[in-house]
Structures are given as C-alpha cells and as structure tokens.
Amino acid sequence: MRRGPRSLRGRDAPAPTPCVPAECFDLLVRHCVACGLLRTPRPKPAGASSPAPRTALQPQE
C-alpha cells in the first residue's frame, strides 16, 4: 500500500517551500496548491479571543 507523503518525512523538516501568488501550502500533504482547493477553519465570531497566527498555509506575498 502506498504510504502517505508525510510518512516519509523526517521530524526536523525544513520550512515550507514558498508558494507562488494565488497558491497556498497544503499542510497535510506538504506542497503548494491552488488556494481554492483548501478549506480553512470557520471564522471566529466577532470579539473572539486571539486571532489565529499567520501560518505557512496562507498565500505568499
């Protein structure tokens, strides 16, 4: 059976590869894909505490 790509990674992984504009880093398979293919967490209601920090998932600027 084919192993998932994450099964082949060492624990000390390098930082995510920068993605081109309009692409996002898929944290689950560790590569860049069109941002529209990924679903982000539901937005917090107004006034919710501590917004989530920027992550490698988001488009590169």
Epitope: R3, G4, R6, S7, R9, R11, A13, A15, P16, D26, L27, L28, V29, V33, G36, L37, L38, R39, T40, P41, R42, A52, T55, A56, L57
Partner: antibody, heavy 117, light 111 residues
C-alpha cells in the same frame, strides 16, 4: 455550512461486501479532504482513510486494502467500498471533512454496518 | 503509526469542577511550528464534535470554558468549570502523519 448524509449501512454476512455513500452539500468534494471514520459499538474512533481534492486516497494500513474510497464529483458524493467484511468491521461509519489542519469540523450522522451470519 | 494515549480513561466529576484530560503521542506531532493535535467531544448516539484544533485554537461556537495546551508529544484539554452538558467522551487526534490516529477516549461521568 457543510452537510453530510451517509447511507448504505445494514446487515451483511462475513465475507460479503457493502458500499456506503456520503452525500455532501454546502461545499464541493473537489476541494479539501473527505474522510471515513468508524466506531465499533462501545469503542473509540478509528480513522479509515481519505480522498482529497486531487483524488488522492490514503487508508489506514490496518484495513489491509479491503476498503476503497472513491467519489462521484457530478453527484458530490463520497463512497466507501468494503470487501471481505469481518465481524470486527461492525461499526457506525461516519464521513467527515476537515479544515486545513486535519481537524474534522463537519461530520455526518453515521450509518451502522453489522457483519454477522 | 503514531500512538495516542489518553489519561485517565474515565473520571467522575461534579458540575463546576475543573477537569483536565491529557493526551500523549508516541512521537512529536509538531511540524512548521504547528501542533497537529485536535480534541473532540462525543455524546452517546451522536457524531463527534470538534472542540479544539491545532492544540489550542477554540473551534467556532465552542464555549470558552474549553481550552487546550501543549506541544510536541504532551497535550492537555481543560474544562474550567464543568457544566451538565459536558458529560461525554473526549478524544484527541493527531493529523501530523498518516495514518491519522485517535486516542482511546476519556469518559467524563457525573460524580
């Protein structure tokens, strides 16, 4: 709001086959990850596998290739084909979809599969 | 596979109590500075409900009495003041490496 509705569960004899369906609404199954998770009676949760936006599948190795996940994008429906069923496959089968970190924030109601002679 | 071990397996508590559940992974579930660790609540006959993702982020709509902490291999779910609707079974899950795995569950019962 994503809604997931499973169907196709029921009683099947050992060695038999069954195909479960999960109809999704509120989002396209051509984006994100679409999972099956099962729960034997009185037991914990066990991840079965997923199919993602590209059609890539990955399975729990403990299932030994007996299960196959597929999709019909025209129907926005996910499937779980289960072959060579055993008594220990008796469980409620849920479909679920996670957001970017793999946390499954939408779940179906589950469908019960009973493997018994 | 990454093994997830929850403790305790069950506990009895009263309304208003502070409850702590721990989950230990057999190897680190961190990558890119993110902990791929999530917590769910499940009530009998119902599907699981996501409470906490990425170790400490509260899912939208979940009461603030739930919180999560930890990194690497050791994680904690805390209910600051247990409410009647919180009596349920709680599961941790890692999505750092395939196959994704769950803890065995912690059942929170009424004392």
């Amino acid at each position: 709001e994503v809604q997931l509705v499973e169907s196709g569960g029921g009683l099947v004899q050992p060695g038999g086959s069954l195909r479960l369906s999960c109809a999704a609404s509120g989002d396209s199954i051509t984006r994100g990850y679409w999972n099956w998770v099962r729960q034997a009676p009185g037991k914990g949760l066990e991840w079965v596998g997923y199919i993602n936006y590209s059609g890539t599948t990955y399975y729990n190795p403990s299932l030994k290739s007996r299960f196959t996940i597929s999709r019909d994008t025209s129907k926005n429906t996910l499937y779980l084909q289960m072959n060579s069923l055993r008594a220990e496959d008796t469980a409620v089968y849920y479909c679920a979809t996670p957001h970017t970190y793999g946390a499954m924030d939408y779940w179906g109601q589950g469908t019960l599969v009973t493997v018994s002679s | 596979d990454i093994q997830m071990t929850q403790s305790p397996s069950s506990l009895s508590a009263s309304v208003g109590d502070r409850v702590t559940i721990t989950c230990r992974a057999s190897e680190s579930v961190d990558d890119y500075g993110i902990s791929f660790m999530h917590w769910y609540q499940q009530k009998p006959g119902k599907a699981p409900k996501l409470l906490i993702y990425r170790a400490s982020d509260l899912e939208s709509g979940v009461p603030s009495r739930f919180s999560g902490s930890g990194s690497g291999t050791d994680f904690t779910l805390t209910i600051s003041s247990l409410q009647p609707e919180d009596f349920a079974t709680y599961y941790c899950q890692q999505t750092s490496k395939d196959p994704w795995t769950f803890g065995q569950g912690t059942k929170v019962e009424i004392k």
